[in-house]
């Protein structure tokens, strides 16, 4: 009978970094080993390929490598086929994106004394914590009529005034690393007294 000496196990992995799913098999006859991802055979590429009976990743990809991997062994003489335990990656990643206007719907609708909400489109796993900046200066919660939570990706200005004008950017960090906004947002609010 086919015996798995080493079975693949679920593990943490970093986006773009190396990883290895191990599989070692013993059987009476010569063995063919191949891998399944969500039940479909894994084809070798430069990025992901069989290394002996193990599966090697030159650069883990959160989209292409999400799912359940299984090592499958076939004894060529007896015809027996057996599958290993399931294994998957907990892929840690962070990806930069722009700062966008969430409310109101368009810049034309921004008026003094209205509420303005900006959104930081930096995503990641685990969920990152966010830091906002105006003209390069970090913003902390509760100062100058704005609400910001490091857990939330939104910055709310209520009410918005001329003192809030400036270039808004954000950065986020997680166990994987840090990223800052790829595109920033310039907020211009005219002084009503003029």
């Amino acid at each position: 009978a086919i015996v798995f000496i080493k079975q693949p196990s679920s593990q943490d992995a970093l986006q773009g970094r190396r990883a290895l799913l191990r599989c070692e098999v013993e059987a009476p006859g010569p063995v063919h080993v191949y891998w399944l991802l969500d039940g479909a055979p894994v084809q070798d590429t430069e990025r992901r390929f069989a290394q002996g009976s193990s599966l090697s990743f030159a650069a883990v990809d959160r989209l292409q490598d999400s799912g359940t991997f299984q090592c499958v062994a076939r004894d060529d003489v007896t015809g027996e086929e057996a599958r290993s335990a399931n294994a998957s990656f907990n892929i840690k990643w962070i990806e930069a994106g722009p700062v966008v206007l969430k409310h109101p719907a368009s810049e034309a609708e921004i008026q003094p004394q209205t509420q303005v909400t900006l959104r930081c489109h930096i995503d990641g796993h685990p969920r990152p914590t966010y830091q906002w900046f105006r003209d390069g200066t970090p913003l902390s919660d509760g100062q100058s009529n704005h609400t910001v939570s490091s857990k939330e990706r939104n910055l709310t200005l209520r009410p918005a005034g001329p003192e809030h004008s400036g270039l808004y950017s954000c950065c986020a960090h997680s166990a994987f690393g840090q990223a800052c906004s790829s595109q920033n947002f310039t907020l211009s609010i005219a002084d009503e007294s003029f």
Partner: antibody, heavy 113, light 111 residues
Framework: QVQMQQSGAELMKPGASVKLSCKAT????????IEWVKQRPGHGLEWIGE????????NSNEKFKGKATFTADTSSNTAYMQLSSLTTEDSAIYYC??????WGQGTLVTVSA | DIVLTQSPASLAVSLGQRATISCRAS??????????MHWYQQKPGQPPKLLIY???NLGSGVPARFSGSGSGTDFSLNIHPVEEDDSAMYFC?????????FGGGSRLEIK
């Protein structure tokens, strides 16, 4: 012990289809590949294809695509191979085998007008 | 497809002597540290019987007079000493790739 019992000889007309059976006993049917091999006098042995009954997954020789279809019934531990659009070239002995070790006795198919 | 060329197509060997059959593959049949090359014996009216698997491993119940060797593309089956009962057809087969392919066969006659 492992045994592969194949169905009896068939005399068929050109253009017809035939379904050969291979009943497996003595092992867990779903976990082993069953292969099919053709033998014609003077043509040696030809590998047609294979099926893993537990999953229904199969592999086949490109040469027999459209000619041979593999199925398996796990309730009766029987594998089947259907041959379609028969011609005299399909006249042969057909073997089923579990891996390389356990072979059926063969089924003779004769195609004649 | 991997093409297997067997030679000779037929041979006649005296009782007690050595019979050697060769099988050459059009490309290597080695993978995972094994040679996926096998040898069968077939007698009239019977299915093929596995003699040697993975180039050099003796099949279950096969006498030690049978031996196999080789790797990559060149393989051979040896029978020594030959016995009367060894009169049969012998086939090599590769199972590294689909489609699995067989050699053309070698007929052994005992003198």
């Amino acid at each position: 012990q492992v045994q592969m019992q194949q169905s009896g000889a068939e005399l068929m007309k050109p253009g017809a289809s035939v379904k050969l059976s291979c009943k497996a006993t003595g092992y867990t049917f779903t976990g082993y590949w069953i292969e099919w091999v053709k033998q014609r006098p003077g043509h040696g042995l030809e590998w047609i294809g294979e099926i893993l009954p537990g999953s229904g997954r199969s592999n086949s020789n490109e040469k027999f695509k459209g000619k041979a279809t593999f199925t398996a019934d796990t309730s009766s531990n029987t594998a089947y191979m259907q041959l379609s659009s028969l011609t005299t070239e399909d006249s042969a002995i057909y073997y089923c085998a579990r891996g390389k070790l356990s072979w059926g006795q063969g089924t003779l198919v004769t195609v004649s007008a | 497809d991997i093409v297997l060329t067997q030679s000779p197509a037929s041979l006649a060997v005296s009782l007690g002597q050595r019979a050697t059959i060769s099988c050459r593959a059009s490309e290597s049949v080695d993978s995972f540290g094994n040679s996926f090359m096998h040898w069968y014996q077939q007698k009239p009216g019977q299915p093929p019987k596995l003699l040697i698997y993975a180039a050099s491993n003796l099949g279950s119940g096969v006498p030690a007079r049978f031996s196999g060797s080789g790797s990559g593309t060149d393989f051979s089956l040896n029978i020594h000493p030959v016995e009367e009962d060894d009169s049969a057809m012998y086939f090599c087969q590769q199972s590294k790739e689909v489609p699995r392919t067989f050699g053309g066969g070698s007929r052994l006659e005992i003198k």
